[in-house]
């Protein structure tokens, strides 16, 4: 079998909301993946599991099941959303993200994603990790491909 390539493109959108009383930040982060099937037969993208970390703490998880089938020598772009919560022992971040003296509130998040594909009963997992800047003070949307230059570090191979 030939390879199945997973490329993390970047953040497609980050929508922020706050609970003022609980000093909690809610960030809905939509990411984009390109999955390329280099085989001459179809493969099924069985599931995508993702998590987001801030300062080594997991702040959000998501899982998508039975996603799509990718035809021979084809590529599909898949968006997945991870709801994240920055709260409790990290509530000090609320002060930073809502600081009224500055307009830009960048934080660095680690995006982790694992794609499970199956073909002819065989299962394969491909993982990616990528650090991304997100502005926790405002909503942000990106044009396609605009955010693939946001990498703080290269993905682990």
């Amino acid at each position: 079998p030939r390879s199945i390539d997973v490329k993390y493109i970047g953040v497609k959108s980050a929508y922020v909301s706050y609970d003022v009383q609980k000093r909690t930040i809610y960030l809905n982060i939509t990411n984009t993946l390109n999955i390329t099937n280099n085989n001459y037969y179809s493969v099924e993208v069985e599931n995508i599991t993702a998590q987001v970390q801030f300062s080594k703490t997991v702040i959000g998880k998501a899982r998508l099941n039975n996603i799509t089938i990718i035809g021979p020598l084809d590529m599909k772009q898949i968006d997945y959303t991870v709801p994240t919560v920055i709260a409790e022992e990290m509530s000090y971040m609320y002060d930073f993200c809502t600081l009224i003296s500055i307009k830009v509130h960048n934080i660095v998040l680690m995006m982790q994603v694992t794609v499970t594909t199956t073909y002819f009963g065989h299962s394969e997992q491909i993982s990616q990790e990528r650090y991304q800047y997100v502005d926790c003070g405002r909503n942000t949307t990106y044009q396609l491909g605009q955010s693939e230059y946001l990498n703080v570090l290269q993905p682990q191979q």
Epitope: V20, I100, V104, Y133, V134, D135, G137, R138, T140, Y149
Partner: antibody
Framework: EVQLQQSGPVLVKPGPSVKISCMAS????????IHWVKQSHGKSLEWIGL????????NYNQNFKGKATLTVDTSSRTAYMELNSLTSEDSAVYYC???????????WGQGTLVTVSE | DIVMTQSPSSLSVSVGEKVTVSCKSS????????????LAWYQQKPGQPPKLLIY???TRESGVPDRFTGSGSGTDFTLTISSVQAEDLAVYYC?????????FGAGTKLELK
């Protein structure tokens, strides 16, 4: 519909101060920054500053420090701007507007015309 | 403070025409972290408050017709109206949304030829 209802036009003499108001309805007052913007007749827009109703925190344009004072009364869901030492240069339409925290200013009041004249 | 310079100051147009308004900032409006440009465009009709059209240099506000397009990066930005309608006759302002104090361009007045 979201509303920022501003007080009516005022005609004042040079010297003293004037206080104009901006009453919020239909949205959670404490969840937004309230901005104040000046527009002199036929001119562009000048950002005066903002106030955060939740804690009364303010951020002023240095050009308006000492000229404008921004306050809020959360019980009446009203933001106020007081302008002091009035001169003809202060004659303008003053807008209050809101932004969801650091998002762009997305909604504006109808404006209050302040005329400073003998 | 960031100075916003708009050109032209006024434009005479016919309905259906394509229009471009330029805006230059004295400092970059790029958030070097997330690579997003923090520039907004507003439309103001006579006797009305400004209305947000575009934010993040290129993202249309909800309900804004797709004939309005924002582009540009760093210090050079453009608002394009692909086919001007009579209701588009107004003054257009660009605004620095990157740092305080928020600053606006002098405006571009769109008039009917």
């Amino acid at each position: 519909e979201v509303q920022l209802q501003q007080s009516g036009p005022v005609l004042v003499k040079p010297g003293p101060s004037v206080k104009i108001s901006c009453m919020a309805s239909v949205f959670t007052f404490n969840d937004y920054y309230i901005h104040w913007v000046k527009q002199s007749h036929g001119k562009s827009l000048e950002w005066i500053g903002l106030v955060y109703p939740y804690n009364g925190g303010t951020n002023y344009n240095q050009n308006f420090k000492g000229k404008a004072t921004l306050t809020v009364d959360t019980s009446s869901r009203t933001a106020y701007m007081e302008l002091n030492s009035l001169t003809s240069e202060d004659s303008a339409v003053y807008y209050c507007a809101r932004s969801y925290f650091s998002n762009p200013i997305g909604y504006w009041g109808q404006g209050t015309l302040v005329t400073v004249s003998e | 403070d960031i100075v916003m310079t708009q050109s032209p100051s006024s434009l005479s147009v016919s309905v259906g025409e394509k229009v471009t308004v330029s805006c230059k900032s004295s400092q970059s409006l790029l958030n070097s972290g997330n690579q997003k440009n923090y520039l907004a465009w507003y439309q103001q009709k006579p006797g009305q408050p400004p209305k947000l059209l575009i934010y993040g240099a290129s993202t249309r506000e909800s309900g804004v017709p797709d004939r309005f397009t924002g582009s540009g990066s760093g210090t050079d930005f453009t608002l394009t109206i692909s086919s001007v309608q009579a209701e588009d006759l107004a003054v257009y302002y660009c605004q620095n949304d990157h740092s305080y104090p928020l600053t606006f361009g002098a405006g571009t007045k769109l008039e009917l030829k």
